[in-house]
């Protein structure tokens, strides 16, 4: 199975608590209405932007308390035996290539951060997302070309890496020898995806790459 039901629920951000509250309010007012998620998200983020620090304080307190709860629960949490396998990442495996948007962010993050020093990680990412969406197709092209080149290189590298076979991870109690090659590859793909997610988090990237050129 995918997740361990005993694993502590992930910690929620102040904004997530705010959205949750908005949802509950909306449900109370319109119990039968179906929610247009993107519209709802937009309205929430607009409302959040106009809120004072005092108003946000309540949600920040909730987030702090939840962080403490999560850390407390994680201290006593023992993952199931098989789960340690996910933790192993071969340092020699080719790194998943960045997307065009990710490359663009690396270029313009310093400007956004410099111009708005107090901006949260999420808001920096949001501004970069808006910037990307307002960028004409031809101005995205250099980033798309570079991303395509890196993807091509990655595909060659990963093919060569798989052809060589992974280092003997079995010794580390990671991959059982009897697993089929297909399953092994599926897992590698999954790990690659997680790698990119982790990298994007490290790079302050929580922004979706919605490349909607007109």
């Amino acid at each position: 199975g995918k997740g361990d039901p005993k694993k502590p629920r992930g910690k929620m951000s102040s904004y997530a608590f705010f959205v949750q509250t908005c949802r509950e309010e909306h449900k109370k007012k319109h119990p039968d209405a179906s929610v247009n998620f993107s519209e709802f998200s937009k309205k929430c983020s607009e409302r959040w932007k106009t809120m004072s620090a005092k108003e946000k304080g309540k949600f920040e307190d909730m987030a702090k308390a939840d962080k403490a709860r999560y850390e407390r629960e994680m201290k006593t949490y023992i993952p199931p035996k098989g789960e340690t396998k996910k933790k192993f990442k071969d340092p020699n495996a080719p790194k998943r290539p960045p997307s065009a948007f990710f490359l663009f962010c690396s270029e313009y993050r310093p400007k956004i951060k410099g111009e708005h020093p107090g901006l949260s990680i999420g808001d920096v990412a949001k501004k970069l997302g808006e910037m990307w969406n307002n960028t004409a197709a031809d101005d995205k092209q250099p980033y798309e070309k570079k991303a395509a080149k890196l993807k091509e290189k990655y595909e060659k590298d990963i093919a060569a890496y798989r052809a060589k076979g992974k280092p003997d991870a079995a010794k580390k109690g990671v991959v059982k020898a009897e697993k089929s090659k297909k399953k092994k590859e599926e897992e590698e793909d999954e790990e690659d995806e997680e790698d990119e997610e982790e990298e994007e988090d490290e790079e302050d990237e929580e922004e979706e790459e919605d490349d909607d050129d007109e």
């Epitope: 270029e107 310093p110 400007k111 410099g114 307002n134 960028t135 101005d139 995205k140």
Partner: antibody
């Protein structure tokens, strides 16, 4: 105050080379895309080339592709345009310009220009 | 390449007049249209970006409108310092082309 100051223009023979420089001050140079726009005597404006903040991404007009190279040195706050295989039609005032809005070519600040004359 | 055509090429007007310059693109450029003012022997100066956003420090008598392929720059009441050349530019597609210019002179 934002300032862009071009230098390096002059008279050069067809087939010759020239390197233009643009010294930037009054803003954080490494945050902005910058580029070159030229204007032939008595004529309109023509976009020549652009370069991303880090210098890792470049764009060129077809008329100069393969002959001109744009580069930047963020530690020196300077933009460059290396012009090779110059032709008579490259004669123009060359302006260095800053793109104020990300990668979009909206030139919010310009230098005073440097004249390049290609003639035998 | 996207062709930008300005009309008129030159225009005579008096102080206090309202003037309009038209810029047409030969294909849709959404709102990626900018206007510049250039005085003789000087560098161009950005007036309006994204069709209608006035740059800071630009007097409110300047305004821009349009979308798709047809755009206008209007000056509501001409001042002596407004006599100059005006260029439109598309920032939608490479190469980022300019109109041929409109020379605004005193009648």
């Amino acid at each position: 105050e934002v300032q862009l100051l071009e230098s390096g223009g002059g008279l050069v023979q067809p087939g010759g080379s020239l390197r233009l420089s643009c010294a930037a001050s009054g803003f954080t140079f490494s945050w902005y895309e910058t580029g070159w726009v030229r204007q032939a005597p008595g004529k309109g404006l023509e976009w020549v080339s652009g370069i991303s903040p880090s210098g890792g991404y470049t764009q060129y007009a077809d008329s100069v592709k393969g002959r001109f190279t744009i580069s930047r040195d963020n530690s020196k706050n300077t933009l460059y345009l290396q012009m090779n295989s110059l032709r008579a039609e490259d004669t123009a005032v060359y302006y260095c310009a800053r793109s104020g809005v990300g990668a979009t070519k909206i030139f919010d600040y310009w230098g005073q220009g440097t004249l390049v004359t290609v003639s035998s | 390449d996207i062709q930008m055509t300005q009309s008129p090429s030159s225009l005579s007007a008096s102080v206090g007049d309202r003037v309009t310059i038209i810029c047409r693109a030969n294909e849709r450029i959404n709102t990626y249209l900018n206007w510049y003012q250039q005085k003789p022997g000087k560098a161009p100066k950005l007036l309006i970006s994204g069709t209608s956003s006035l740059e800071s420090g630009v007097p409110s008598r300047f305004s821009g409108s349009g979308s798709g392929t047809e755009f206008t720059l209007s000056i509501s009441s001409l001042q002596p310092e407004d006599f100059a050349s005006y260029y439109c530019q598309q920032s939608y597609s490479s190469p980022y082309t300019f109109g041929q210019g409109t020379n605004l002179e005193i009648r």
